[in-house]
């Protein structure tokens, strides 16, 4: 069960704001995991799939220990904007094979948009600059084949899953330092 819909609670407590962002991130993580599992059931993946247009994972050894809140929020927002674009692209160009997952992809997109709004609100409350992506946006062309769109879906969901885990870990870790 996801959190109830509705506008964010007004608060001047950064811990409460972070809590709210963590909750949405955890909800989205659960949705993504479920959808990735559905994908694996319907279209078994042979090994790891990657997509050049996806952001590189915001994780490297030692990263979490040295995180600062502005960096986490900025990086997370930029990466999630990229994933949102990829989910929109999947829904638009995924072809008939992914049409069966359309309701789930639609729900995932809505949750992603909601989390992005919450992060934007949190950043404005903390007076952080709303950074634009530093890398140029790579246009997403149509998948080469039906199998290409399935591989892309595996890559997008897998990457989003790991990014959200990094986000929950990072945000909760930062909360302990506030």
């Amino acid at each position: 069960p996801g959190p109830p819909a509705g506008s964010p609670r007004v608060s001047s407590d950064p811990r409460a704001d972070l809590d709210s962002a963590v909750l949405l991130t955890r909800s989205l993580l659960a949705d993504t995991r479920q959808l990735a599992a559905q994908m694996r059931d319907k279209f078994p993946a042979d090994g790891d799939h990657s997509l050049d247009s996806l952001p590189t994972l915001a994780m490297s050894a030692g990263t979490l220990g040295s995180l600062q809140l502005p960096g986490v929020l900025t990086r997370l927002r930029v990466d999630l904007m990229s994933y949102l674009r990829h989910v929109q692209w999947l829904r638009r160009a995924g072809g008939p094979s992914l049409k069966t997952l359309e309701p789930e992809l639609g729900a995932l997109q809505a949750r992603l948009e909601r989390l992005l709004r919450r992060l934007q609100l949190l950043m404005s409350r903390l007076a952080l600059p709303q950074a634009a992506p530093d890398q140029p946006v790579i246009p997403l062309g149509p998948p080469a084949s039906a199998w290409g769109s399935i591989r892309a879906a595996h890559a997008i969901l897998g990457g989003l899953h790991l990014t959200l885990d990094w986000a929950v870990r990072g945000l909760l870790l930062l909360k302990t330092r506030l």
Epitope: S27, M59, L64, L162, R169, L173, K175
Partner: antibody
Amino acid sequence: EVQLVQSGAEVKKPGASVKISCKASGYTFTDYNMDWVKQAPGQRLEWIGDINPHGGGPIYNQKFTGRATLTVDKSASTAYMELSSLRSEDTAVYYCARGELGHWYFDVWGQGTTVTVSS
Amino acid sequence: DIVLTQSPASLALSPGERATLSCRASKSVSTSGYSYIHWYQQKPGQAPRLLIYLASNLASGVPARFSGSGSGTDFTLTISSLEEEDFATYYCQHSRDLPPTFGQGTKLEIK
């Protein structure tokens, strides 16, 4: 069958270090975090920290920061925990456990490694 | 850190009886429909085994006689009809914040 198999019991002197391994099998290693939990005699279970095998940095319980080091060898589906500057209070059973991403509940556990610190 | 207190410390019951174990958190571990409490069973010389996750979800392979309930700060693990193999120590654990912490355990003994 999903399994976590840990290295054998260790006896160490105070001030020494110990490195425990945890070999995962039966699932995709990078789909879950690997957590470590301490169980000292007569004490409650204590979470030490976790690591995302996909390449994320570890996170630690503040109590263990600076003494515990978590690493993984992705190619061997193996996680490691090293504990340094050992003291008698570190005498315990140490478990590795598979952690659900973002939720910190542990659905598969290793059999445990007993570490005894004694002079 | 959030402190979890389990009660009773020990409980002696007979097979077939109903067991009710309690776990109280020092602050709320629930938020918007999610309760970040999990329950484990541990037998002597063995590793803990996950029974219930997120307050009320039965872990894979766990018999339906186990159930979890509660929200906010008060949680309950119920075993509807005790079997011989259920006599063990039970721990609750939260994952609302970092670090996750465990209760001190409730030892369930045969009467």
